[in-house]
Interface confidence: low
């Protein structure tokens, strides 16, 4: 556990007066309908709120929307609906906010049936002004910004055309017809699939994958017989139909589709699916669905090329294609992921990995909790976390697990303590060490958020009754103060704080209901006066991440290195501040077998760190597809884990002999590719 100070709860001095002076109410002159909120830029304080209200008439639905803008983190709002000519905005497209701090916003308007094309409102000054633009097409999807250049936009039309703008939506050009899916890659590259015969659905498995690197001037066909494609980290994936049957396999490219290799993953049938759970520049977590309607599959982790995969976790809960999985990247500590497995008895259990999928274990039982009715042994059980699946099942779980990269080690989640996830009302648990140890933080379900990089945690009870109380903690959830933010309770709908957890402002959204009318209302509370002073060096303490045995020389080593962090002391009530940067010191570890994954044709027997040959491949030359050629692999069975930085110690050697035979099984070999220009 991260360093905690004394367990006694001291009250934050005069907090009621301090918070009362910093609580700002805004009542929206609106009927209730729906509300959506977007932050424009980072640390700008600009929020856009779109309220929409549908009035069902006999023959049609009449819609009305209003747009509000705040530039002080939600303390005050101004009605700017007139800037968009009082137009009804389509909420299904949301507000398309530009990347980074570009200040760009695109709103898509509802237009009448007979119009030639859609209409958008564009702003490039953080929504101070908008320009109306009529489109030469009806958009099917939200405008997508190029990550590299916010002036470049792409959109699909209802006619399946791929449209591109190079001047932030001022002018549009259709660069290709018959397009099913389009995505921005790196360097302003666009990848998209096209159909030749009937439609996207009819041609599934016979689509072509195309690439343009110059916004539609020229194209290259980089794949055929495509079912779907995806981008993750530096990897481009395509699922490709097999020649002889209805199965498909994953192929992977790390050079934008110029060359492809077949991923060493099981093929899947018509009813199955692949899903990229997480990807970075080092590796990929891939879920492969089991045959039949089982609701589970297997997680595999890739090598650094995305080609060789190790089985990471069996019976991984993932209901259907596009369905629910609890897979969660714990962003507050490197290498940590949490997910759920479906056990043989159909109960759901939570598993955690601290080493990027190398090993999975149950979550340690919180010290201050009893095992519930699901536990066979009342003294031995574990914590089980509620995530997307529980929410989809309408359990009393208002929020998924929460972690933030700049609130090091902190994870907050709803959970139950037993042998499996319980359908009983959950409590909220917190870990301050990235998931190694847990403590019950709050009784019953709550909404929660992290402010000031972990300096403050805010929570609101999940209740069907109106509420007027907010809870906050300045010591990572050990002690809680309650603050009544209004005399008149509201029906609570959500907590909003600026993404990135650096802000000290929280907005409580809800509505008031009277006999005749209901109105949207927000309360924005600024905690700056609770954290009166800036944190000094004395407020921080050294913390070794992943530490489980301080006496062990290799303590804290994960993926070949350990990291010491400066962590805010729980007893320190001070501001990390908006420009707080996580301070960490890495040190390299010696290599052990744990730093290597098993190469193609090898596997790790349970509870063993050695890689042994797969019996069915023993004595055979190992041949596999790499860049459209068959490779002959001579190996002692080990390959370094992607992202592992260990040095010295154990060093298994590997070599690859290239037979340069063409792969018959690779449908994406370079010979099959062609280019064309517009």
């Amino acid at each position: 556990s991260a360093p905690g100070e004394d367990e006694e709860c001291g009250r934050v001095r005069d907090f009621v007066a301090k918070l009362a002076n910093n609580t700002h109410q805004h009542v929206f002159d609106d009927l209730r309908g729906s509300v959506s909120l977007s932050w424009v830029g980072d640390s700008t304080g600009v929020i856009l709120v779109l309220t929409t209200f549908h009035v069902p008439l006999v023959i049609m639905t009449f819609g009305q929307s209003k747009l509000y803008r705040s530039e002080d983190y939600g303390k005050n709002f101004k009605d700017i609906t007139d800037l968009i000519n009082n137009t009804f905005i389509r909420t299904e497209f949301g507000m398309a906010i530009g990347p980074e701090n570009s200040g760009k916003v695109v709103l898509t308007a509802e237009v009448s049936g007979g119009s030639r094309g859609g209409r958008i409102f564009r702003s490039s000054d953080f929504a101070k002004n908008f320009v109306q633009t009529d489109l030469p097409f009806h958009p099917l999807t939200q405008m997508m910004y190029s990550p590299q250049n916010s002036d470049y936009l792409l959109a699909l039309s209802t006619e399946n055309g791929l449209w591109v703008s190079k001047n932030f939506g001022g002018k549009w050009e259709e660069i290709h017809k018959a397009v099913c899916l389009a995505k921005w890659g790196s360097d302003n590259t666009i990848f998209f699939t096209t159909y030749a015969n009937g439609s996207c659905k009819a041609d599934l498995g016979a689509l072509e994958l195309w690439r343009t690197s110059d916004l539609g001037k020229s194209f290259k066909t980089i794949g055929v017989k495509i079912y779907s494609f995806g981008l993750g980290g530096r990897f481009l994936f395509a699922s490709v139909m097999a020649d002889k049957d209805t199965t498909r396999r994953i192929h992977v490219s790390t050079d934008q589709g110029d060359t492809w290799s077949m991923a060493q993953l099981p093929s899947v049938g018509q009813e199955q699916f692949y899903s990229i759970l997480a990807a970075n520049d080092d590796m990929v977590f891939m879920h492969v669905d089991e045959p039949g309607d089982t609701g589970f599959g297997t997680i595999f982790t890739s090598d650094d090329r995305g080609i060789v995969y190790s089985k990471s976790l069996d019976r991984h809960l993932y209901t259907t294609t596009g369905g629910e999985t609890d897979f969660t990247n714990v962003t507050s500590l490197r290498g940590v992921y949490i997910t759920s497995v479906l056990s043989e008895d159909n109960s759901i259990q939570t598993m955690i990995t601290f080493d990027q999928g190398g090993r999975w274990t149950h979550l340690r039982k919180p010290e201050n909790s009893e095992c519930d009715a699901t536990a066979k042994n009342k003294n031995e059980c574990s914590l089980h976390i509620h995530a997307s699946y529980s929410i989809s099942q309408k359990l009393n779980v208002p929020m998924a697990p929460l972690s933030e990269p700049n609130a090091v080690g902190i994870v907050i989640a709803h959970g139950s303590v037993g042998d499996a996830i319980s359908v009983m009302v959950p409590d909220v648990y917190i870990s301050d060490d990235g998931g190694y140890s847990w403590t019950k933080m709050l009784e019953g379900p709550h909404y929660y958020t992290i402010l000031d990089s972990g300096g403050i945690i805010v929570a609101i009870e999940h209740s069907s009754r109106p509420i007027n109380v907010i809870k906050f903690s300045t010591d990572e959830g050990q002690c809680w103060q309650t603050y009544t933010f209004t005399r008149d309770p509201i029906y609570f709908t959500g907590l909003a704080s600026e993404p990135g957890a650096r802000s000290m402002n929280i907005s409580i959204w809800g509505f008031t209901e009277s006999f005749l009318t209901s109105q949207w209302v927000s309360y924005t509370i600024d905690f700056k006066d609770i954290l009166e002073r800036n944190c000094e060096e004395k407020d921080y303490t050294i913390w070794l991440a992943h530490s489980t045995d301080p006496e062990d020389y290799e303590d804290g080593c994960i993926l070949g290195y350990k990291e010491q962090f400066l962590r805010l002391r729980k007893s320190s009530v001070c501001q990390n501040g908006r420009d707080y940067v996580v301070t960490k010191q890495p040190s390299i570890c010696l290599c052990s077998l744990e730093d290597f994954l098993c190469d193609f044709g090898y596997y790790r027997p349970e509870n063993d760190s050695k890689c042994v040959e797969q019996p069915e491949l023993k004595g055979h030359d190992l041949e596999f597809c790499l860049y459209g050629r068959e490779e002959h692999l001579t190996t002692n069975g080990y390959r370094k884990i992607p992202g592992d930085k260990c040095q010295g110690g154990v060093n298994p050697v590997r070599e690859v002999k290239d037979l340069k035979k063409k792969c018959t099984s690779n449908f994406l070999s370079p010979e099959k590719q062609n280019s064309k220009s517009n």
């Epitope: 000094e536 060096e537 004395k538 050294i542 006496e551 303590d555 040190s587």
Partner: antibody, heavy 129, light 107 residues
Framework: QVQLVQSGAEVKKPGASVKVSCKAS????????MSWVRQAPGQGLEWMGI????????SYAQKFQGRVTMTRDTSTSTVYMELSSLRSEDTAVYYC??????????????????????WGQGTTVTVSS | EIVMTQSPATLSVSPGERATLSCRAS??????LAWYQQKPGQAPRLLIY???TRATGIPARFSGSGSGTEFTLTISSLQSEDFAVYYC?????????FGGGTKVEIK
């Protein structure tokens, strides 16, 4: 209680090496950096360098670079300081001192210093021919 | 490296009187400064850290002040056990450096 116990006095000839040990007890050894400080007869204190017990990374004062080696053994919670190519001016009392803020060496932007809060009893090293 | 200069080299004070010791850094060390007391034949003992915070068990008559380049250690009423050599030390930038020391002797 927290204490640092150092090895006994040494007499060495010029050109030789000396290795002084410092055994920590009463606290988690890997949580704190350890500095070495020496004091020549009738002189002031001189900082020689620091070691991080986690990982064993070191930082030495320029004056001792190439002659001093600091190591640690986490299994015995012991830190070692070895000084080679001894000369008569190395005659001094050598102290190990727990240094909670050694991390400031890695992060020069540190704004606070906790001081060397626990000291060993000192080891006298005499260099004479 | 940062050079620490202490003054005076020797301070003669009668028991019960106030003693003021100075320490100057050649460049700013913020508040990354500690004061130590050393008696003959003993290891140094930490008195003040962070320029002004008393270490555990140190009597209230010892106080530290200053930041940046100028620092002061004050002993409000000297006791017989306070006669010793006092060193300041910076830890703003490596290498850590000590001042030459101030000897407080009985007048």
């Amino acid at each position: 209680q927290v204490q640092l116990v150092q090895s006994g006095a040494e007499v060495k000839k010029p050109g030789a090496s000396v290795k002084v040990s410092c055994k920590a007890s009463g606290y988690t050894f890997t949580k704190y950096y350890m500095s070495w400080v020496r004091q020549a007869p009738g002189q002031g204190l001189e900082w020689m360098g620091i070691i991080n017990p986690i990982g064993g990374s070191t930082s030495y004062a320029q004056k001792f670079q190439g002659r001093v080696t600091m190591t640690r053994d986490t299994s015995t919670s012991t830190v070692y300081m070895e000084l080679s190519s001894l000369r008569s001016e190395d005659t001094a009392v050598y102290y190990c001192a727990r240094d909670p803020s050694g991390i400031a060496l890695a992060f020069p932007a540190s704004r606070y210093y906790y001081g060397m809060d626990v000291w060993g009893q000192g080891t006298t090293v005499t260099v004479s021919s | 490296e940062i050079v620490m200069t202490q003054s005076p080299a020797t301070l003669s004070v009668s028991p019960g009187e106030r003693a003021t010791l100075s320490c100057r850094a050649s460049q700013s060390v913020s508040s990354n400064l500690a004061w130590y007391q050393q008696k003959p034949g003993q290891a140094p003992r930490l008195l003040i850290y962070g320029a002004s915070t008393r270490a555990t068990g140190i009597p209230a008559r010892f106080s530290g002040s200053g930041s940046g380049t100028e620092f002061t250690l004050t002993i409000s009423s000297l006791q017989s056990e306070d006669f010793a050599v006092y060193y300041c030390q910076q830890a703003r930038l490596g290498p850590w450096t000590f001042g030459g020391g101030t000897k407080v002797e009985i007048k």
